[in-house]
Interface confidence: low
């Protein structure tokens, strides 16, 4: 079975961990696919390790475990995320997470944030 938090929220500009937990007494995980709606985010395979889709490579970090850390979130990242566990034997198990990206608390308070970069 797949156990996951069905609904999670995070702040714009922040990061979030997408995590599915697979439990079985007999099946071995051979591959995990992560998708944002229908778009591939990342794939983990037992022998070949992680592959992150190039379009997300600057914002998606593999882990912890078989999950993903999604960084620099934007409002457009709000939506459904799916983990697909390929197991042997036992077939395919899927989990769903709904991520809601909210405005940062400072923005909601009407405060503008400025950051100056040092010259040189």
């Amino acid at each position: 079975t797949i156990d996951t938090k069905r609904n999670i929220s995070a702040e714009e500009g922040g990061s979030v961990i997408l995590q599915c937990h697979f439990s079985s007494d007999t099946a071995e995980v051979t591959q995990v696919d992560w998708k944002q709606q229908d778009q591939l985010l990342a794939i983990y395979s037992v022998d070949l390790g992680w592959h992150v889709a190039s379009v997300f490579s600057d914002r998606v970090v593999p882990g912890p475990s078989l999950g993903l850390t999604f960084q620099s979130l934007t409002m457009n990242d709000t939506g459904e995320y799916f983990c697909t566990y390929h197991t042997y034997p036992g077939g395919i198990y899927k989990g769903r997470i709904f991520l809601k990206v909210q405005e940062s608390s400072d923005d909601r308070n009407g405060l503008a944030q400025f950051q100056t970069a040092p010259l040189g």
Epitope: T30, Q31, V46, D47, L48, H86, Y88, I92
Partner: antibody, heavy 116, light 110 residues
Framework: QVQLQESGPGLVKPSETLSLTCTVS????????MSWIRQPPGKGLEWIGI?????NTYYANWAKGRVTISKSSNQVSLKLSSVTAADTAVYYC????????????WGQGTLVTVSS | DIQMTQSPSSLSASVGDRVTITCQAS??????LAWYQQKPGKAPKLLIY???TLASGVPSRFSGSGSGTDFTLTISSLQPEDFATYYC????????????FGQGTKVEIK
């Protein structure tokens, strides 16, 4: 250069175990996937199974319980038990087969006939 | 299980013809697809991997396209040495699979 060579008996009796060896040169099995494929006379390619770089094995549904793939330093072995005439085929080994760059190269193949 | 379905199973064509072979996967395999050519009595030869990348030494008249579930092998101008059987192969998943290959397409002389 990369080379693969299958070897083993060309004739196996029904109910016995088919044993083949694929000897490789020009690359390391410790960082490669190796696949076994067979082709019955006049028919298409049938995948048998694969062994990963770390020794993990995955077998075709039809072969589970009958097939064992293993490897040593420069050889990959295939054992198929309880053979019948339907297992008569040309057997190939090939490098790759899972999230790689295709199966390449292939051995030349060896014909195994199951008959009493 | 992922099933690979090739079409047509055979075709007749003339030298110089443009030939197209299709391969359909029963589920999304992204770009994890390879194409092979096999001539009678010989081992298969890799033509294309990752759906569209030409293998080393393969003539540029061969090309591959597609992703997800639908893939195509195209021979832009058929040559005498291209009469053979062609197979697609999914590389996406090896657990819980019956066969990674399509059933083959035989290209014959018209």
């Amino acid at each position: 250069q990369v080379q693969l060579q299958e070897s083993g008996p060309g004739l196996v009796k029904p109910s016995e175990t088919l044993s083949l060896t694929c000897t490789v040169s020009g690359f390391s099995l410790s960082s490669s996937y190796m696949s076994w494929i067979r082709q019955p006379p006049g028919k298409g390619l049938e995948w048998i199974g694969i062994i990963g770089s770390n020794g993990n094995t995955y077998y075709a549904n039809w072969a589970k319980g009958r097939v064992t793939i293993s490897k040593s330093s420069n050889q990959v072995s295939l054992k198929l038990s309880s053979v019948t005439a339907a297992d008569t085929a040309v057997y190939y080994c090939a490098r790759g087969g899972y999230r790689t760059s295709g199966m390449d190269p292939w051995g030349q193949g060896t014909l195994v006939t199951v008959s009493s | 299980d992922i099933q690979m379905t090739q079409s047509p199973s055979s075709l007749s064509a003339s030298v110089g013809d443009r030939v197209t072979i299709t391969c359909q996967a029963s589920q999304n395999i992204y770009s994890d697809l390879a194409w092979y050519q096999q001539k009678p009595g010989k081992a298969p030869k890799l033509l294309i991997y990752r759906a569209s990348t030409l293998a080393s030494g393969v003539p540029s008249r061969f090309s591959g396209s597609g992703s997800g579930t639908d893939f195509t092998l195209t021979i832009s101008s058929l040559q005498p040495e291209d009469f053979a059987t062609y197979y697609c192969q999914q590389e996406h998943l090896v657990a819980w699979i019956y066969n990674v290959f399509g059933q083959g397409t035989k290209v014959e002389i018209k």
